[in-house]
Interface confidence: medium
Amino acid sequence: MNGSEYFVKIQSFLGGAPTEDLKALSQQNVSMDLATFMKLRTDAVLPLTVAEVQKLLGPHVEGLKAEERHRPVRDWILRQRQDDLDTLGLGLQGGIPNGYLVLDLSMQEALSGTPCLLGP
């Protein structure tokens, strides 16, 4: 069974998938469609790297631009370094500016909804 066929079989169960499962899926050549990606738990999507999302979505990564103002894409963008987002070649804006440090302060983030940044 190839990645696409496997994805079809598990698609309906993915809404509640944890980050670890999404990371594993990104290595399986599944080409997750954007409709499914948009239904994923925001907290599961946030830790994914740009490279992992690109692998997870396959051709559908080109559609992220259309969803950049919607959750979970909007929140995921806020967590990525702008440098990394730029490598997607989609003109996504809103990432962490170059030269900033990201402090993983869970309480701060829980309260504000955004990561804590220290300027250069």
């Epitope: 469609d33 559908h60 080109e62 631009k65 997607l88 003109g91």
Partner: antibody
Framework: EVQLVQSGAEVKKPGASVKVSCKAS????????MHWVRQAPGQGLEWMGN????????NYNEKFKNRVTITVDKSASTAYMELSSLRSEDTAVYYC?????????????WGQGTLVTVSS | DIVMTQTPLSLSVTPGQPASISCKAS??????IAWYLQKPGQSPQALIY???YRYSGVPDRFSGSGSGTDFTLKISRVEAEDVGVYYC?????????FGGGTKVEIK
């Protein structure tokens, strides 16, 4: 207005290489991936591959993987498709087309096509 | 690779009459399908994306439907300018693939 202007027709001998250019205007070149599709005389459409203009990352159709190279010149908003070890079956019209422009998937815009004739 | 099979190969239609083209995918592609029309001597032009949405400027006599593996493009009333070859294309996974085409002619 989106415009894709391709280089002129080429006649090549078997075993040679050809490099076709596609100059884009009317949109942000680095925000949309560029794809190449070919069409042999009287035949259907065949996807060759694409390129991410931001970092020159590419995906290729396995059928062409060892013979095709897709590159970009960001400063000139131009994409290139080079096909090597040409054979008569490569005689075709080659099209460039960005995907997902205006947030809609699919190839909404196409270059005018470049006819490559391979003949001894 | 996902194989896209179009039927019929050709279609001869009386102006004002409907026409229907079928496209079957060898595996589930959701609604990640586009339809194109290539008029004689021209580059392809986009008609439908996401299986059922018309691109701007496309007349409403064109409609698309289907999901999974079976898709249909319908022209409610064929006009002379609709002649050409129609292609379906999946963008669900690499490599992107096209159907073999359906040639539409006017009777």
């Amino acid at each position: 207005e989106v415009q894709l202007v391709q280089s002129g027709a080429e006649v090549k001998k078997p075993g040679a290489s050809v490099k076709v250019s596609c100059k884009a205007s009317g949109y942000t070149f680095t925000s949309y991936w560029m794809h190449w599709v070919r069409q042999a005389p009287g035949q259907g459409l065949e996807w060759m591959g694409n390129v991410n203009p931001s970092n020159a990352g590419s995906n290729y159709n396995e059928k062409f993987k060892n013979r095709v190279t897709i590159t970009v010149d960001k400063s000139a908003s131009t994409a290139y498709m080079e096909l090597s070890s040409l054979r008569s079956e490569d005689t075709a019209v080659y099209y460039c087309a960005p995907h997902y422009i205006g947030s809609r998937p699919g190839f909404a815009y196409w270059g005018q096509g470049t006819l490559v004739t391979v003949s001894s | 690779d996902i194989v896209m099979t179009q039927t019929p190969l050709s279609l001869s239609v009386t102006p004002g009459q409907p026409a229907s083209i079928s496209c079957k995918a060898s595996q589930n592609v959701g609604t990640n399908i586009a339809w194109y029309l290539q008029k004689p001597g021209q580059s392809p032009q986009a008609l439908i994306y996401s299986a059922s949405y018309r691109y701007s400027g496309v007349p409403d006599r064109f409609s698309g439907s289907g999901s999974g593996t079976d898709f249909t493009l319908k022209i409610s009333r064929v006009e002379a300018e609709d002649v050409g070859v129609y292609y379906c294309q999946q963008y669900n996974s690499y490599p992107l693939t096209f159907g073999g085409g359906t040639k539409v002619e006017i009777k």
